[in-house]
Amino acid sequence: VPRWRQQWSGPGTTKRFPETVLARCVKYTEIHPEMRHVDCQSVWDAFKGAFISKHPCNITEEDYQPLMKLGTQTVPCNKILLWSRIKDLAHQFTQVQRDMFTLEDTLLGYLADDLTWCGEFNTSKINYQSCPDWRKDCSNNPVSVFWKTVSRRFAEAACDVVHVMLNGSRSKIFDKNSTFGSVEVHNLQPEKVQTLEAWVIHGGREDSRDLCQDPTIKELESIISKRNIQFSCKNIYRPDKFLQCVKNPEDSSCTSEI
């Protein structure tokens, strides 16, 4: 008799999830010499232990602590790039500007990027059919709690000038409900972080507005200022040119400073 399975509103665990995590771990530790000491089997065991046999709406940050410990990594605290709703450009940027880091350039972020996972209460099975949706089902699901945990730690580690890339094509350029707006902003440490600099990325050439004057950016400025952190903002009108000038800063057509 087939056992009844909880149907959630979100997509199920990514196909070949265990193999993907393990393979990513091996690849990452091969590429990054400072992480070569990491035992990827132990990392997978800790990852699995965070959600297997647990109700997927009852996951806590504590469940991920063994994984956090194994994935402890030091990145230059003054070279952190946060992003919201514009992941691809942020990643293209750090692929060129190799001394800057998004969360997904760290081991734990790299392992989980674009993946979904959940288990079932009291069974060792991974649920490949469906997983809880943050809005429709529950917020304390394995994926959401993971990103909340690693995002908080990443923001806490930041110092000096922290950059954030924001999507100027969205109706809410700064969204208080995004991971950046709900977690990272509130976990920047005022005693370490001097300035948050926002780069507002424009979507098309016909948009000549100064999006740094957008009401949601003013809201972000207010939140940051109340936390005794300075705020600055730049319009990136031409993201294609921006990336090009990161690659070729000496070119005569790249006179602006990033």
Partner: antibody
């Protein structure tokens, strides 16, 4: 030395088609937006079309929208303008022009121009 | 779109004299304005951008001023090679638009 050399102009009947080319040299072509600007005989300058660095964004004046197509081949350092459904009022010298775009600044002017190619639409 | 209006249509000036050309925008274009010179049978040449910055290789006798909606190109002492048509262009709002031109002729 920056050089822009247009070609492909000529006499064409109304409703006909032409493809203009602009060969660029003396600079890194893919670092610049490029535009076509035209000038009817004895008249002023009119911007026609522009294309972004990699050709993924294109822009057109209302007067040519749906009839003209701008494109570029960065491997060949060449800008193109495919002109279909040509009308008498499209008769002009067509210039290709370089735009020194900046990523943190919206607008742009034209810092180098080709010598132009004449397109005559007449029956 | 923004309409650029140049005046006068024709300016008659003697060599060595000062020439003042005006360009007006139908709405503010901040300082996003360029000036071009065009001689018969030739392509336009960039003179001024950012309303007042001379392009590379442009003589100091050419100067630009203004912001918002009113702009001026001044040629302090006209040389024989300066007799040409001059165009202004705004690049503050899409699409970029040109003025109709001012012809500077020998008096």
């Amino acid at each position: 030395e920056v050089q822009l050399l247009e070609s492909g102009g000529g006499l064409v009947q109304p409703g006909g088609s032409l493809r203009l080319s602009c060969a660029a040299s003396g600079f890194t072509f893919s670092f610049y937006d490029m535009s076509w600007v035209r000038q009817a005989p004895g008249k002023g300058l009119e911007w026609v079309s522009a294309v972004s660095l990699y050709g993924d964004e294109t822009y057109y004046a209302d007067s040519v929208k749906g009839r003209f197509t701008i494109s570029r081949d960065n491997s060949k350092n060449t800008l193109y303008l495919q002109m279909n459904s040509l009308r008498a009022e499209d008769t002009a010298v067509y210039y290709c022009a370089r735009e020194p775009v900046s990523y943190d600044y919206y607008g742009s002017y034209f810092d180098y121009w080709g010598q132009g190619t004449l397109v005559t639409v007449s029956s | 779109e923004i309409v650029m209006t140049q005046s006068p249509a024709t300016l008659s000036v003697s060599p060595g004299e000062r020439a003042t050309l005006s360009c007006r925008a139908s709405q503010s274009v901040s300082s996003n304005l360029a000036w071009y010179q065009q001689k018969p049978g030739q392509a336009p040449r960039l003179l001024i951008y950012g309303a007042s910055t001379r392009a590379t290789g442009i003589p100091a006798r050419f100067s630009g001023s203004g912001s918002g909606t009113e702009f001026t190109l001044t040629i302090s002492s006209l040389q024989s090679e300066d007799f040409a048509v001059y165009y202004c262009q705004q690049y503050n709002n899409w699409p970029w638009t040109f003025g109709q031109g001012t012809k500077v002729e020998i008096k």
